[in-house]
């Protein structure tokens, strides 16, 4: 969490941002809140990106002002206009690109004063893994697949019964480049699995950590997946 205060001139206002990560090809949110003002027409929101010649987004007098928007953000940004009055300056970024990563500044002017706060925005690809029994294999085998990751993640297998065991000798992981030549499909195979055990396939890079669990018994198979972003720090 980054909390910024205003500088010079009028009183300072508190602006708060939260570091976040964007999944390339999907829409992302750059979070920013501020002390609200009673008049929408008195609020100016500017989003800037370090090292960029134009603005990321500007909202003033109750509407978008995009005359000085940088070309790399053209047609891809929006604020939540109906929530600005209550202090939400968050920015929606459409079709996140790898090059959107960097340091952003949320700069606010209201009748109470000015304030700004920076946020770090990471970009990459992350997806939920799915673990299945590979019935085509000669021995009992599990196959963990996740369609989109970038940068290349690490894959670690774990088991509930053999806690602390190292499965690197009995697993094989491959990374297959997807058609857009950036993200990769992750496939990891675990051999010699035993029945009545829960296995976890953990995929992690510097942006996200995802886990796919599978419990195999003689009567049923239970699956569970979850994904966690690693860098959500508020400022």
């Amino acid at each position: 969490l980054i909390i910024g205060f205003g500088i010079s001139g009028r009183h300072s206002i508190t602006v708060t941002t939260v570091a976040s990560a964007g999944n390339i090809g999907e829409d992302g949110i750059l979070s920013c809140t501020f002390e609200p003002d009673i008049k929408l027409s008195d609020i100016v929101i500017q989003w800037l990106k370090e090292g960029v010649l134009g603005l990321v987004h500007e909202f003033k007098e109750g509407k978008d002002e995009l005359s000085e928007q940088d070309e790399m953000f053209r047609g891809r940004t929006a604020v939540f206009a109906d929530q600005v009055i209550v202090g939400n300056a968050s920015l929606r970024l459409k079709n996140v690109q790898l090059t959107d990563a960097g340091t952003y500044k949320c700069y606010i002017i209201t009748s109470k004063g000015k304030g700004n706060a920076n946020l770090e925005y990471k970009t990459g690809a992350f997806s939920m893994p799915e673990v299945n029994v590979d019935y085509n294999a000669s021995s009992e085998t599990l196959r963990c697949e996740a369609p989109r990751w970038f940068p290349q993640p690490t894959v670690v297998w774990a088991s509930q019964v053999d806690q602390g065991a190292n499965f690197s000798e009995v697993s094989n992981t491959s990374f297959e480049l997807n058609s857009e030549n950036v993200t990769m499909k992750v496939v990891s195979v675990l051999y010699n699995v035993t029945i009545n055990n829960t296995y976890s396939c953990m995929i992690e890079n510097d942006i996200a950590k995802a886990t796919g669990d599978i419990k195999v018994t003689e009567s049923e198979i239970k699956r569970r997946s979850h994904l966690q972003l690693l860098n959500s720090k508020a400022s």
Partner: antibody
Amino acid sequence: EVQLLESGGGLVQPGGSLRLSCAASGFTFSSYAMSWVRQAPGKGLEWVSAISGGGGSTYYADSVKGRFTISRDNSKNTLYLQMNSLRAEDTAVYYCARDIQWYGESTLFDYWGQGTLVTVSS
Amino acid sequence: DIQMTQSPSSLSASVGDRVTITCRASQSTRSWLAWLQQKPGKAPKLLIYKASSLESGVPSRFSGSGSGTDFTLTISSLQPEDFATYYCQQYGSYSRTFGQGTKVEIK
């Protein structure tokens, strides 16, 4: 201490190509946009091209659009200018300069290289 | 692209003189204007940015003013080391444009 050092200039025939480099040191290179500026012999300054800190945006003067390509390698702290289809009027000293860090807030063109001479002649 | 027109293109002045150079933009560039000084055979040097902000290390005899389309560089008391060519430069759009330059010579 901030330093910018251009290289790659020289004599080239019309229609030829040349690649200029600018090695940067003394500052966080990826935090700044960078520009190329040229100066023909006895003439004024002409902005040529700029690139954002992360390399996601590139900008060109109309006179070089479609012929020149600006790029950067932040891992090497180096800025490049690939110049193709060179013409006699491209003859100039080419400078790299540190451009803006934050829109509307920071100085720009506060540091310059010493320049590298490009001569286009048959 | 925004065009920048400087005047005069050259001027002769004496040490101690007050010198004023003007720069006009073809359309508004807000306050996104810089002034640079160049001496023969040297790279340009930034003097003023954001129309009126003095770059660190630049003597206080240099000052800038204006906004929108009309800008002025003033040297309050010309010194021997100030004889050089001065350029205005806009950065209010993605392109950066320089004026054609003003050469300040010794009278």
